[in-house]
C-alpha cells in the first residue's frame, strides 16, 4: 500500500493576511486565523512529518480584499510560489480582470501547473494561452506518480469576464477523455481538482470513470467528521464518500473558504491505484499555529503599497452620497442607488443575443450601508471612504430566485417599518410601492422589475412563478437580517466580487458620479 497526503485550499479570495474568525479584517491578533504565513507553518510541518504530500488549490484565489484590487493577481502568484503549491485549478474569479488579467500576473508567473480540462481556447487566444494552463498534469510524488485533472464552473461566462475566446464545456464530458488519456499513460492514481461546487464535485465522483479523489471548491462547503472546531456547520462528513457508477467509493473534499482551514486528507492506495482507505479533516488555522516569520515579513513588505492605495482618489462625487441610517433604513437613498448601479454594472455579460444582460435586478439591505460620503471634500472618493460605507468585507453575489421569493423578501423589508432596522431594501432594476397602512406581510402593492430578455429595457410586473437572477450581498444570500426565505428558497447561488471593489471599480470607470433619488421605492398616498 502507498499513502498520499493531500493538503488543499479553495476560495481563499485574497485572504493573504490573517483574518478574524468570520474572515473579515483581523482586529485582535490573538484571536485571528488563516493567512498565508500561518498556512505555510502548518504545510511545512506536515511536509516534514509525512513522506508523500501534495498541496493543491481548487480555485478562486482571486478577488476579495484590497490585496487583489491593488496587486491584481501578482500577489497570488508570489505567495503561492512561496508556499510551493503543487497545482491549482482555475476558478471563475480568476477571470475577473479578463483573460489578460489571468495570463500576465498569474499564468506567466506561477511555478506550478494551473489546470482546467473543460476550458478550451479558440481564435487568436488559442496560441497566446497555449501551455499557460493545462488540462492535466502528472506529478511525481516519491516513487509514484499522481495525475491531477482540473475543471472550472461552466457558469463562468455568467459569473466573470472570460471573454469570447474561451469555451467552457460540460465538466463531466470534458474530464472523461483526459482521465482516459492519463490511464493510457499508466497513471493509476487520479485526483480531479476543480471549481464547480459541491454538487458537481459529487457528480464527477459518480460519473467520471477513473477518478479516485475529488478536491473541490466554489460552494465554500465545510465538511467535518466529529465536533467542528469553529462556527462553520458541516454539510457532511470529511471526506464525503460517493459511490461511483462503477461501484467504487470516491472521497470528495472541500475546505470551506478564505484560508481559514487547510484541508487534510490521507489516502491509501493499493498497488493497482485503487483507494483502500481515506480519512482526515480540515485543520483550523487558528492562533495556536504561529505565523511563519519569513512569509510574514514578506507580507508586511507587500502591505506598504496597500496603505498608500487606500488614500488615493478613485473618482469624484458632485452630490452628497446619503448613506445615513436615517435615510437608507427608511426610504430610497442615493448611496443605495449608487451601490446597486455598481452591482449591476459589474455583472454586465452579453452572453446571449436575446438578452441585453443576464441580470437586471439588485437588492441591498439598508443596514449594510454604514456611512455617508460628503461631497464637500473636493468631491474626492477614496477606498478608505468606501471602506467606511461597506466595512464588512462582503461580496455581491448572483442568485436565482422565484418571483414569489422576491415578493416575500420585499414584504420582509417593511414588516416592522419605522424602527430603523437594517432589513429595509435598497434596489436597482426594481420599482416597488409599499402601502404601510396594510398589515405586515401584505404591504407590497406594486412590484415591477426590469426585463432582461428585451432590447429596450422596461419595467414589467413581477411574475410569481418566474425565475429571476438577482445581485445581492452575500449577507442576504445567507439569510441575514431575517431574509430566511432567500436562503431557504434560492435556486442557485454563486459568490461574487468584493463589495468595496465593485463600487470602487464603478466610480473609477464613471470618474464623476451624481446618483439621485429617482422613485425606485415609493409609498402609496396617505401611508407615509
Amino acid at each position: 500500500a502507498w499513502e498520499l497526503t493531500i493538503l488543499h485550499t479553495n476560495d481563499v479570495h485574497s485572504r493573504l493576511e490573517q483574518t478574524s474568525e468570520d474572515s473579515s479584517k483581523c482586529v485582535n491578533a490573538s484571536r485571528c486565523m488563516g493567512g498565508v504565513a500561518r498556512l505555510f507553518t502548518k504545510v511545512q510541518q506536515i511536509r516534514r512529518a509525512e513522506p508523500n504530500v501534495l498541496l493543491l488549490d481548487a480555485g478562486d484565489q482571486y478577488q476579495g480584499t484590497i490585496w487583489f484590487t491593488v496587486y491584481k493577481g501578482a500577489e497570488v502568484a508570489h505567495f503561492m510560489n512561496a508556499l510551493r503549491y503543487d497545482a491549482m485549478a482555475l476558478g471563475n474569479h480568476e477571470f475577473d480582470n479578463g483573460v489578460e488579467g489571468l495570463i500576465e500576473p498569474l499564468l506567466k508567473e506561477a511555478k506550478f501547473p494551473i489546470l482546467s480540462a473543460n476550458i478550451k481556447a479558440k481564435g487568436p487566444l488559442a496560441s497566446q494561452i497555449s501551455g499557460l494552463y493545462l488540462p492535466y498534469k502528472v506529478l511525481p510524488v516519491g516513487d509514484e506518480v499522481v495525475g491531477i485533472v482540473g475543471y472550472t464552473s461552466k457558469e463562468t461566462p455568467f459569473l466573470s469576464n472570460p471573454g469570447t475566446n474561451l469555451v467552457f464545456e460540460d465538466e463531466i464530458t470534458a474530464l472523461q477523455p483526459e482521465v482516459d488519456k492519463l490511464k493510457t499513460l499508466n497513471v493509476n492514481k487520479i485526483i480531479a481538482l476543480g471549481h464547480s461546487g459541491f454538487e458537481m464535485d459529487k457528480l464527477i465522483a459518480q460519473k467520471v470513470r477513473g477518478v479516485d479523489v475529488v478536491v473541490g471548491g466554489h460552494s465554500n462547503t465545510f465538511l467535518y467528521t466529529g465536533n467542528p472546531p469553529s462556527k462553520e456547520v458541516p454539510a457532511g462528513k470529511y471526506p464525503f464518500i460517493v459511490t461511483s457508477d462503477d461501484g467504487r467509493k470516491v472521497p470528495v473534499v472541500q475546505a470551506y473558504a478564505f484560508g481559514k482551514y487547510l484541508g487534510y486528507l490521507k489516502i491509501e492506495f493499493d498497488e493497482r491505484g485503487n483507494v483502500i482507505s481515506s480519512h482526515g479533516n480540515p485543520i483550523l488555522l487558528n492562533s495556536s499555529i504561529p505565523e511563519d516569520p519569513s512569509i510574514k515579513a514578506d507580507i508586511n513588505k507587500w502591505r506598504i503599497k496597500l496603505d498608500n492605495y487606500s488614500t488615493q482618489e478613485l473618482g469624484k462625487t458632485i452630490v452628497y452620497l446619503d448613506g445615513s441610517s436615517q435615510s437608507c433604513r427608511f426610504r430610497e437613498c442615493n448611496m443605495g442607488n449608487l451601490i446597486c448601479d455598481a452591482m449591476i454594472n459589474n455583472n454586465l455579460r452579453h452572453t446571449d443575443e436575446m438578452f441585453w444582460n443576464h441580470v437586471s435586478m439588485c437588492i441591498l439591505n439598508g443596514g449594510g450601508i454604514r456611512s455617508p460620503i460628503d461631497e464637500r471634500n473636493n468631491g474626492t472618493i477614496t477606498w478608505e471612504n468606501l471602506a467606511a460605507v461597506l466595512p464588512f468585507g462582503g461580496t455581491f453575489d448572483l442568485v436565482q430566485l422565484k418571483g414569489s421569493t422576491l415578493k416575500k423578501a420585499f414584504e420582509h423589508s417593511v414588516h416592522r417599518y419605522g424602527q430603523s432596522t437594517g432589513e429595509f431594501l435598497q434596489v436597482g432594476g426594481i420599482h416597488v410601492v409599499y402601502d404601510l397602512s396594510r398589515k405586515p406581510g401584505d404591504r407590497v402593492v406594486k412590484l415591477d422589475v426590469l426585463c432582461t430578455k428585451c432590447r429596450v429595457p422596461s419595467y414589467d410586473p413581477l411574475k410569481m412563478d418566474e425565475v429571476y437572477k438577482v445581485i445581492l450581498p452575500n449577507f442576504l444570500a445567507n439569510g441575514g437580517d431575517g431574509f430566511q426565505m432567500i436562503k431557504d428558497e434560492l435556486l442557485r447561488h454563486d459568490s461574487g466580487d468584493q463589495d468595496i471593489n465593485v463600487v470602487s471599480t464603478y466610480i473609477s470607470k464613471m470618474k464623476v458620479i451624481y446618483p439621485a433619488v429617482e422613485g425606485r421605492i415609493k409609498f402609496s398616498t396617505g401611508s407615509h
Epitope: 510551493r84 506567466k108 511555478k111 506550478f112 497555449s130 501551455g131 498534469k137 502528472v138 488519456k181 499513460l185
Partner: antibody, heavy 122, light 110 residues
Framework: EVQLVQSGGGVVQPGRSLRLSCAAS????????MHWVRQAPGKGLEWVAG????????YYADSVKGRFTISRDNSNNTLYLQMNSLRAEDTAVYYC???????????????WGRGTLVTVSS | QSVVTQPPSASGTPGQRVTISCSGS????????VNWYQQLPGTAPKLLIY???QRPSGVPDRFSGSKSGTSASLAISGLQSEDEADYYC???????????FGTGTKLTVL
C-alpha cells in the same frame, strides 16, 4: 547576475568515481530546482538528473540510475553530481542548469553553467 | 535513442523564414509544455522559448514557438547569420519521470 561556476571534471578510469560541483550565485539558490545535463563530443544534449529546491525530490535519466547521485547544499549554494561506476559512454561535457521553478518537473532551464569535461578512459 | 526527434539539419538564406519541427509522444510533448534552447558553437545552451511560445526577455521576436498535439515547432523569421547554431526542443516526460531533449537540429545560414 546569475552565475553557475562548475568544477570537478577531468580524466577518470572506467569503474571509478568523480564528483562534480556547481557553485551558484546571483539568485536565492534554495528557491529553485537544479539539473545536470550532458553533451557527449559531437552529440546532442542529454538530461542527466534533477533535484527539487529542498532536495526532497530527485529525478534521474535511466542511463545513470543507480550510478549517479544528485545532491545540493543550500547553506553553501552548491549543487553536486556524484558519479560512480563510470563508463566510457559517460564521457561528455557536463552542464549545471538552474530551473525556473522549484519542483524540477515543471519549469524550464533558464540559466546554464559553462560546462566541465569528464573523460572516462583507461 | 531519443524519444523526441528533430530533423538533423535545416538551412536558409539571410532574411528567410525557417521552421524546425520537434516530434514526441503523448507522455512528453502531448502532456507537457515545450521549451527550446539555442546552442551557439562552443558555448553552453541558452533558453530561447519556454511554455510552448513564451520568449524570455532579450530574445528577439523573430523567434516563435508553437505546439499542436504531440509535435512542436520553432520558427525563425528574418534569418540572420548569428542564428547559425544547434537548436534543441525539450519537455518533461511523464512515463520516464524525467526531462527529455530532442535530437537537435543544426541550422546553417547560407
Amino acid at each position: 547576475e546569475v552565475q553557475l561556476v562548475q568544477s570537478g571534471g577531468g580524466v577518470v578510469q572506467p569503474g571509478r568515481s568523480l564528483r562534480l560541483s556547481c557553485a551558484a550565485s546571483g539568485f536565492r539558490f534554495s528557491d529553485f530546482a537544479m539539473h545536470w545535463v550532458r553533451q557527449a563530443p559531437g552529440k546532442g544534449l542529454e538530461w542527466v538528473a534533477g533535484i527539487s529546491y529542498d532536495g526532497g525530490n530527485k529525478y534521474y535519466a535511466d542511463s545513470v540510475k543507480g550510478r549517479f547521485t544528485i545532491s545540493r547544499d543550500n547553506s553553501n549554494n552548491t549543487l553536486y553530481l556524484q558519479m560512480n561506476s563510470l563508463r566510457a559512454e559517460d564521457t561528455a561535457v557536463y552542464y549545471c542548469a538552474k530551473d525556473h521553478g522549484y519542483s524540477g518537473y515543471y519549469g524550464h532551464l533558464d540559466y546554464w553553467g559553462r560546462g566541465t569535461l569528464v573523460t572516462v578512459s583507461s | 535513442q531519443s524519444v523526441v526527434t528533430q530533423p538533423p539539419s535545416a538551412s536558409g538564406t539571410p532574411g528567410q523564414r525557417v521552421t524546425i519541427s520537434c516530434s514526441g509522444s503523448s507522455s512528453n510533448i502531448g502532456s507537457n509544455t515545450v521549451n527550446w534552447y539555442q546552442q551557439l558553437p562552443g558555448t553552453a545552451p541558452k533558453l530561447l522559448i519556454y511554455s510552448n511560445n513564451q520568449r524570455p526577455s532579450g530574445v528577439p521576436d523573430r523567434f516563435s514557438g508553437s505546439k499542436s498535439g504531440t509535435s512542436a515547432s520553432l520558427a525563425i523569421s528574418g534569418l540572420q547569420s548569428e542564428d547559425e547554431a544547434d537548436y534543441y526542443c525539450a519537455a518533461w516526460d511523464d512515463s520516464l519521470n524525467g526531462r527529455v531533449f530532442g535530437t537537435g537540429t543544426k541550422l546553417t545560414v547560407l
